[in-house]
């Protein structure tokens, strides 16, 4: 996938495709992040990538495609 | 192509136990959440157990404490431990692909093994 | 704990519409899913998200989702077509399955 980024709240990258180990950004998640797919309403949440819920938080997270980043994959990766 | 087997169930004695294996290929099976559905004779699907590809577990109510799953992806297999049967666990048990992560769909199947708990 | 309700049994004349209902408290705000399994067979996915089809699913085969009841329909039903069919959704990290529809194919 693309790079995978949080709500609006929390910045930096989580993890890449399924299958990695997925951590935390902050110093208190030491445990692995565990995914959903994100409820129904969320379905237009990610403008350029996928969404993703977090389960410990309840909170969605998006995989960007590749030459878009920010939280909601928003924003266009002039550089890519 | 895309495929998955089971094998493992069979006759057995209510408290005895049981481990279910689900041989997965065609896939990179390490990137894909699993679970396990079963069917009682002539009756409807129930979901049984998921586990995430990072390692996340979850149960039905009606099995937590009793059955664990599991996989191995170096040996491409899921696996589900049952202990402590009951007559009411008799069922077709599937073992199927969660599309990406937990909460889409399932999208492959395995043909299904048949566990069967009576003295 | 959340709940699918289907009816028993849907009947449909060869060629006819068939239309198999999926009750839920709001379940238009969730993604339904359907399966169809034949007997002796493992279950196979005819529809996802609502109303989107995998590939290499007919497409007489059609859902939709809203307020509290998701439909499955086929059109110009064959007899290939009899079978149990099965709604599902996610709900509470946990999956659930309506309780199946055998579809009757007449004449």
């Known amino acids: 996938d693309g790079n995978t980024t949080r709500t609006p709240e929390t910045n930096g990258s989580l993890c890449g495709a399924p299958g990695e180990n997925c951590t935390g950004t902050t110093p208190r998640q030491k445990s692995k992040t565990h995914f959903s797919r994100c409820p129904k309403q969320y379905k237009h949440y990610c403008i350029h990538g996928r969404c993703r819920f977090v389960m410990d938080e309840q909170t969605p997270s998006c995989i960007c495609e590749k030459g878009y980043f920010g939280a909601r994959c928003e924003q266009v990766d002039l550089f890519y | 192509q895309v495929q998955l087997l089971e094998s493992g169930g069979g006759l057995v004695q209510p408290g005895g136990s049981l481990r279910l294996s689900c041989a997965a290929s065609?896939?990179?099976?390490?990137?894909?959440?699993m679970s396990w559905v079963r069917q009682a004779p002539g009756k409807g699907l129930e979901w049984v157990s998921g586990?995430?590809?990072?390692?996340?577990?979850t149960y039905t109510d009606s099995v937590k404490g009793r059955f664990t799953i599991s996989r191995d992806n170096s040996k491409n297999t899921l696996y589900l431990q049952m202990n402590s049967l009951r007559a009411e666990d008799t069922a077709v048990y599937y073992c199927?692909?969660?599309?990406?992560?937990?909460?889409?769909?399932?999208?492959?199947w395995g043909q299904g093994t048949l566990v069967t708990v009576s003295s | 704990s959340y709940e699918l309700t289907q009816p028993l049994s849907v009947s449909v004349a060869l060629g006819q519409t068939a239309r198999i209902t999926c009750s839920g408290d709001?379940?238009?705000?969730?993604?339904v899913h359907w399966y169809q399994q034949k007997p002796g067979q493992a279950p196979v996915l005819v529809i996802y998200?609502?109303?989107d089809r995998p590939s290499g699913i007919p497409e007489r085969f059609s859902g939709s989702n809203s307020g509290n009841t998701a439909t499955l329909t086929i059109s110009r039903a064959q007899a290939g077509d009899e079978a149990d069919y099965y709604c599902?959704?996610?709900?509470?990290?946990?999956?659930?399955f309506g309780g199946g529809t055998k579809l009757t194919v007449l004449g």
């Open positions: 199927a692909r969660d599309y990406l992560d937990f909460g889409y769909y399932f999208d492959v």
């Open positions: 065609g896939f990179t099976f390490s990137s894909y959440a």
């Open positions: 586990l995430g590809h990072v390692g996340y577990t």
């Open positions: 709001k379940i238009g705000k969730k993604y």
């Open positions: 998200d609502d109303s």
């Open positions: 599902q959704a996610w709900d509470m990290q946990s999956v659930v």
